[in-house]
């Protein structure tokens, strides 16, 4: 899998896509997940509702939502009131019994807001990821009215 | 296999000025967050200052904001850094580092260069 | 900031000890802390990171355990390239901060 990079902003909203072959993927729930580590585990963030024909209803974990078009074979994941340390590798996978297959592989990289003039280094949060070749950036930016959320934090 | 070489290193009075560049090969550059980390002699270890994958945002440890700048080419693999106003307190081994994106540790390190600021 | 502390500064082993060094924050920061190793003359090399994740290559010996605000790295039968200094890192949420070290010494 290639790699796509979707650029946000701190404070912001950042909107991934995923788009996958809804015949292919017929009946299965999605979820996204969070590369901790180069090979390391991906670790769930959030997933579609228990109810396949429910997917297209939103699910939040923290700041983190989901929802799913298995019509239009698009998985969409909302990250709210962005943050620096939630820059990163994630995947979105389209999931069967035990087994995930990743439908996408995203870089999330977190810009730090022009227009706040707050140091740069309270919101700060940096880190890294796994080589991909070729990747494509995809500007995803809307201005966010939510504040105060709480990123997800990894657990082990 | 991911490799970091840094150079520019060597001695400069202070309030002089040195730039230093870290070649990087062994992995797709443009796509990862890199940083500067540093080590003064005997002591332990310092991150100094990182910019995510695009260039487009930079961020600095308190004790070298405004007189440190960090830079990336992304079409030479090479990141750098303009040090400015340096301090007898700024010699130290200087690492390029690649950082993991969201998590802040640093996965792997160039073998390092010196910075000596004295008179 | 928050403030990371290794105990002990230095600590004596020989090969096939089973050792353990800590790390001790000033606040709670969940499971997120990596560990490094340096040996004289050389750059640091992750060991670990979200506290229990080996990185590529590192021997199954060592391990890392805690949460919240105390921290602990064991090796668990020392080899003689073990002998060196290890440094924890309070990762995810920045500063990023470095506790000052211990290191591991042959007996």
């Known amino acids: 899998h290639n790699t796509t990079v979707f650029q946000g902003v701190a404070g912001q909203s950042l909107q991934v896509s995923c788009p996958y072959d809804s015949m292919k993927h017929w009946g299965r729930r999605k979820a996204w997940c969070r590369q901790l580590g180069e090979k390391g585990p991906c670790q769930r963030v959030v997933s579609t509702h228990n109810l396949w024909l429910l997917s297209f209803l939103r699910r939040w974990n923290g700041s983190t939502a989901i929802t799913d078009d298995t019509l239009g074979g698009t998985l969409t994941i909302t990250l709210r009131n962005l943050q620096p340390h939630d820059a990163g590798l994630y995947q979105c996978q389209s999931l069967h019994g035990s087994e995930a297959d990743t439908l996408r592989k995203v870089l999330v990289e977190v810009l730090a807001d022009p227009l706040d003039h707050r140091d740069a280094g309270d919101l700060w949060f940096p880190g890294e990821s796994e080589s991909f070749e070729d990747a494509h950036v995809e500007h995803s930016i809307s201005r966010s009215l939510l504040e105060g959320e709480i990123p997800f934090p990894p657990t082990s | 296999e991911v490799q970091l070489l840094e150079s520019g290193g060597g001695l400069v009075q202070p309030g002089g000025s040195l730039r230093l560049s870290c070649a990087a090969s062994?992995?797709?550059?443009?796509?990862?967050?890199m940083a500067w980390v540093r080590q003064a002699p005997g002591k332990g270890l310092e991150w100094v200052s990182s910019?995510?994958?695009?260039?487009?945002?930079?961020y600095y440890a308190d004790s070298v904001k405004g007189r440190f700048t960090i830079s990336r080419d992304n079409s030479k693999n090479t990141l750098y850094l303009q040090m400015n106003s340096l301090r007898a307190e700024d010699t130290a081994v200087y690492y390029c580092?690649?950082?993991?994106?969201?998590?802040?540790?640093?996965?792997?390190w160039g073998q390092g260069t010196l910075v000596t600021v004295s008179s | 900031d928050i403030q990371m502390t290794q105990s002990p500064s230095s600590l004596s082993a020989s090969v096939g000890d089973r050792v353990t060094m800590t790390c001790k924050a000033s606040q709670n920061v969940g499971n997120n802390l990596a560990w490094y190793q340096q040996k004289p003359g050389k750059a640091p090399k992750l060991l670990l990171y979200?506290?229990?994740n080996r990185f590529t290559g590192v021997p199954s010996r060592f391990s890392g355990s805690g949460s919240g605000t105390d921290f602990t790295l064991t090796i668990s039968s020392v080899q003689p390239e073990d002998f060196a200094t290890y440094y924890c890192?309070?990762?995810?949420?920045?500063?990023?901060?470095f506790g000052q070290g211990t290191k591991l010494e042959l007996k």
């Open positions: 890192q309070r990762i995810y949420n920045s500063p990023w901060t």
């Open positions: 979200y506290t229990s």
């Open positions: 910019l995510t994958n695009s260039g487009g945002s930079t």
């Open positions: 062994g992995f797709t550059f443009s796509n990862y967050y």
């Open positions: 580092t690649r950082e993991w994106a969201g998590s802040g540790y640093f996965d792997y």
